[in-house]
């Protein structure tokens, strides 16, 4: 066969639905690979073919569009499961084209199970909720284009296994679930089903999320430099360890970038000669704010090293501020001979 | 297309037990809950207990807690609801009733089961 | 356990009438509750599923209404064949508990 644009597997896009519900699978070349729609490439000519590898094999085969009730179809630029298999779990293949062009990309589809509380291996998207920041709503995800409008479906919402009713500060509203003021105690998993009749049968969407609530932007404030401090002298002979470190609380903020740096007499650490190691680690809190504690090193640390300026930056979408550690060389106790001889008027 | 079989008719003495089966077919057995609901001779509808066969769950009324046992064989597709100390009272058709979430979406053709001595 | 008590018991109506049927439960259902469909000698059908959804298959005559503790299944023109008792069953709290039944027969 001719030459073909092969995108390869497009791993990026692991897709994974449950097992016994419907799926549609956009083509991905479509989305992500070409710079044209379906309807532009059928209007020229162009056609779009699907096939698959089951998962453990090797050989490439067409896609079956001869089940019983059209388990499996082609519609435009979708492939529709009505419902999934656990076998049909595989790479799958979509390939656009005609006798002078050919385009195709592979994704790997995983049919998964769950259990009957909607546990599962499946990756779960997270929505962060802003702590008692008033009304807040999540949607029952990825589940346009299963149904027209004119059909109505039912919703119903879990916390974990458990239905949602009768919760203080919970409401399910249709594909909505409220939230009336988010607290710590509203952490967890949540799953919609949509229950839906198509040509006289009734089919489910199982949608899990995990809800995590997050630091207010009310209460945000700039970073917060707890060390070093006015407080702590770093005082040290020249041949000691120096250690000071840098903690500082960052306010949780929606994609904000936190930073923590070091300057040794305004240059960053990599750009001095000094034998200075820098280890870093971060702790969260239960509201995801963030505490950032970089830790300066010197092993041998010399008197010129005594005299330098130890600054510690911290920078976030609120602010940036910077803290100089106070250090000092220890003036050596006087030897008890010497102190005698002076004592004595000794020249 | 969904349908539950369900074993034949059973007449069965005052203190003993018994075991109806509910075979299962067009549709994933694994995914969906089993239930278990059973119908006194002109009466009403009484809920049993269910079983999720992915994982085993089972949830019973209080009723029947300690009496009736709800298992379920994947490789079959078949549940069972065994009942035991059979009284005369317990004389009634017996029916599976398979539901994706809690309603009882398809039921079995239900199993008579006559306590006679 | 939840008690659901429905009414009438029985009734007798002409071909195209509208039948209404009401179910009250013991304690608020938050519309977790489905309504069956059952002929005689015959299981039981899902007609109506979370108070108001239509099950697969199901005619549209039939239709569900409610909230909190009262709720009514509604055939808005008899037909023969809707001979049956209808059954409510809450699915809100287990153990799942259904009415006493509704006859409906026609005149």
């Known amino acids: 066969s001719e030459r073909c644009d092969d995108w390869g597997l497009d791993t990026m896009r692991q897709i994974q639905v449950f097992e016994d519900e419907p799926a549609r699978i956009k083509c991905p070349l479509f989305e992500h690979f070409l710079k044209f729609n379906y309807s532009t490439a059928h209007s020229a000519g162009l056609t779009l073919i699907w096939y698959w590898t089951r998962q453990d094999r090797d050989l490439e085969e067409p896609i079956n569009f001869r089940l019983p009730e059209n388990r499996i179809s082609k519609e435009k630029d979708v492939l529709w499961f009505r419902p999934t298999l656990l076998n049909d779990t595989g790479n799958y293949t979509c390939m656009l084209r005609n006798t002078t062009y050919c385009s195709k990309v592979a994704f790997p589809l995983e049919v998964v199970q769950k259990d009957s509380c909607f546990n599962s291996p499946m990756k779960l998207p997270v929505h962060k909720l802003y702590i008692e920041y008033g009304i807040q709503r999540i949607t029952c995800p990825n589940v346009d284009g299963y149904f027209p409008s004119s059909v109505k479906p039912t919703i119903t919402w879990y916390m974990g296994c458990y239905k949602i009713q009768n919760f203080n500060n919970v409401i399910p509203e249709g594909m909505n679930l409220s939230f009336l003021i988010a607290l710590i105690s509203n952490n967890g998993n949540y799953t919609c089903v949509v229950t839906y009749p198509e040509n006289g049968r009734t089919f489910h969407l199982t949608r899990t999320l995990t809800v995590k609530v997050v630091g207010s932007p009310k209460n945000a404030v700039p970073p917060v430099i707890h060390s070093p401090n006015d407080h702590v002298v770093y005082e040290k002979e020249p041949g000691e360890e120096l250690l000071i470190p840098c903690t500082v609380y960052f306010s949780f903020l929606m994609d904000s970038r936190n930073e923590v740096w070091w300057t040794i007499d305004g240059k960053k650490p990599d750009d001095i000669t000094i034998d200075v190691t820098i280890n870093e680690s971060i702790s969260h809190s239960r509201t995801e704010d963030e505490t950032r504690t970089q830790i300066l090193s010197i092993k041998k640390v010399t008197s010129e090293d005594l005299k330098r300026s130890y600054v510690c930056h911290a920078r976030s979408a609120k602010g940036e501020v910077a803290k100089a550690a106070k250090v000092k060389q220890k003036v050596p106790a006087p030897r008890y001979t010497v102190e005698l001889a002076c004592g004595f008027g000794a020249t | 297309q969904v349908q539950l079989v369900q074993s034949g008719a059973e007449v069965k003495k005052p203190g003993s037990s018994v075991k109806v089966s509910c075979k299962a077919s067009?549709?994933?057995?694994?995914?969906?809950?089993m239930n278990w609901v059973r119908q006194a001779p002109g009466k009403g509808l009484e809920w049993m207990g269910r079983i999720y066969p992915g994982d085993g769950q089972t949830h019973y009324a209080q009723k029947f807690q300690g009496r009736v046992t709800i298992t379920a064989d994947k490789s079959t597709s078949t549940a069972y609801m065994e009942l035991s100390s059979l009284r005369s009272e317990d004389t009634a058709v017996y029916y599976c009733?398979?539901?994706?979430?809690?309603?009882?979406?398809?039921w079995g053709q239900g199993t008579l089961v006559t306590v006679s001595s | 356990d939840i008690q659901m008590t429905q009414s009438p018991s029985s009734l007798s109506a002409s071909v195209g009438d509208r039948v209404t049927i009401t179910c009250q439960a013991s304690q608020g259902i938050n519309n977790y509750l489905n309504w069956y469909q059952q002929k005689p000698g015959k299981a039981p059908k899902l007609l109506i599923h979370y108070t108001s959804g239509l099950h697969a298959g199901v005619p549209s005559r039939f239709s569900g209404s409610g909230s909190g503790t009262d709720y009514t299944l509604t055939i808005s023109s008899l037909e023969p064949e809707d001979v049956a008792t209808y059954y409510c069953q809450q699915y809100s709290i287990l153990p799942w508990t259904f009415g006493g039944g509704t006859k409906v027969e026609i005149k």
């Open positions: 067009g549709y994933t057995f694994t995914s969906s809950w």
């Open positions: 009733g398979e539901g994706y979430l809690d309603p009882m979406d398809y």
